[in-house]
C-alpha cells in the first residue's frame, strides 16, 4: 500500500537550508538530505517533511541520501554518508520504486 | 507569482523519445517543500499522473509508465525535464507540469500538446 | 494502488442549481491529502479544494468539500454560468498518485 502521509501532531525539527525561514520549523516528521549535484560539494539539508514520506525509504546512492526521523529535534546531530562511487554499469538509480 | 511553462517538440515520431522541459519562474525549484510534477490528458480523457522529482533528484513514477520514464532536474537553471522512450501514437496527450506542496498541485503549466505520428 | 471513481459521470444542472459531485475511493485515503480541479477546455487544471475541505486561493465560498475514509463530496451551493467545466477529485502526497474519471458539469 501507498504510505499514507497523516496531518496528526506535529513535530518541532531543526531547520537549516537555504529556504528555511529560521531555526526550526513544524511537520509531520522531521528530514535530512545530503545531495551532490554535479562538480559541487555534497550539501546537507535539514527541515520539516508532510509529503512523499516514501523518500525516506529511497536507497542511499552517489548523489543522494534521505533520511527522516519523528521525535523533537531528531535531525539535529545527524550527519550522512553518500554511496562510493561505482562503475556506470552498476550506478544505483534514485527511484526508490 | 509562480509560473511553469513546458517547452518542447510538438511532434515526434513513434519508436523516438519525447522530451519535454518545465522551467519555473516566480519561487526556486530547491526549496523542499516541492515537489515538481508530470501529469499528461490525452484527448478527450482524463489526467494520469507520469511521475515526481524532489530537488534532491529523486524520483516516482507511475508504475504503468516506469520502465520508459525518466525524469530529471537542473537546479541551476530552475528546470525540470520528462523523457519517454520508445513512444507510440497512444503516448499522443496533452502534456502538464504541475507543482505539489501541502496544498495540492497548486500550480500548473498550460500544458503543451505531443503528437507522435510518422 | 488507490481507485478514484467520480459520480455522476455527467451531471446536468441550471444556472442557480446546488451541484453534488461525488469522489469514491477503493480503500481509506488521508483526508489531509484529497484534491479538487475544475478543468474547462483548452486549459489546464485549476486547484479548487485540497486537504479536503480547504478552498484554495481565489476560489469562491460557493464551492465547498467535505468526507473522509472513502466518501468524499464537492458541492458548489448555486452555480453561476462559469462553473460548467469537468471536475476531478485526486488523491496526492504518496505515491501513486491518482486522479479521478471525472465529473462533467454541463448546463441543462
Known amino acids: 500500500d501507498p504510505v499514507k502521509p497523516s496531518r496528526g501532531p506535529l513535530v518541532t525539527c531543526t531547520c537549516e537550508s537555504p529556504h528555511c525561514k529560521g531555526p526550526t520549523c513544524r511537520g509531520a516528521w522531521c528530514t535530512v538530505v545530503l545531495v551532490r549535484e554535479e562538480g559541487r560539494h555534497p550539501q546537507e539539508h535539514r527541515g520539516c517533511g508532510n509529503l512523499h514520506r516514501e523518500l525516506c525509504r529511497g536507497r542511499p546512492t552517489e548523489f543522494v541520501n534521505h533520511y527522516c526521523c519523528d521525535s523533537h529535534l531528531c535531525n539535529h546531530n545527524v550527519s550522512l554518508v553518500l554511496e562510493a562511487t561505482q562503475p556506470p554499469s552498476e550506478q544505483p538509480g534514485t527511484d526508490g520504486q | 507569482q509562480v509560473q511553469l511553462q513546458e517547452s518542447g517538440p510538438g511532434l515526434v515520431k513513434p519508436s523516438q523519445t519525447l522530451s519535454l522541459t518545465c522551467t519555473v519562474s516566480g519561487g526556486s525549484i530547491s526549496s523542499g517543500e516541492y515537489y515538481w510534477n508530470w501529469i499528461r490528458q490525452h484527448p478527450g480523457k482524463g489526467l494520469e499522473w507520469i511521475g515526481y522529482i524532489y530537488y534532491s533528484g529523486s524520483t516516482y513514477y507511475n508504475p504503468s509508465l516506469k520502465s520508459r520514464v525518466t525524469i530529471s532536474v537542473d537546479t541551476s537553471k530552475n528546470q525540470f525535464s520528462l523523457k519517454l522512450s520508445s513512444v507510440t501514437a497512444a503516448d499522443t496527450a496533452v502534456y502538464y507540469c504541475?507543482?505539489?506542496?501541502?496544498?495540492?498541485?497548486?500550480?500548473w503549466g498550460q500544458g503543451t500538446l505531443v503528437t507522435v505520428s510518422s | 494502488e488507490i481507485v478514484l471513481t467520480q459520480s455522476p459521470g455527467t451531471l446536468s444542472l441550471s444556472p442557480g442549481e446546488r451541484a453534488t459531485l461525488s469522489c469514491r475511493a477503493s480503500q481509506s485515503v488521508s483526508s489531509s491529502y484529497l484534491a479538487w480541479y475544475q478543468q474547462k477546455p483548452g486549459q489546464a487544471p485549476r486547484l479548487l479544494i485540497y486537504?479536503?475541505?480547504s478552498r484554495a486561493t481565489g476560489i469562491p465560498d460557493r464551492f465547498s468539500g467535505s468526507g473522509s475514509g472513502t466518501d468524499f463530496t464537492l458541492t458548489i451551493s448555486r452555480l453561476e454560468p462559469e462553473d460548467f467545466a469537468v471536475y476531478y477529485c485526486q488523491v496526492y502526497g504518496s505515491i501513486p498518485i491518482t486522479f479521478g474519471q471525472g465529473t462533467r458539469l454541463e448546463i441543462k
Open positions: 504541475a507543482r505539489e506542496s501541502v496544498a495540492g498541485f497548486d500550480y
Open positions: 486537504g479536503t475541505s
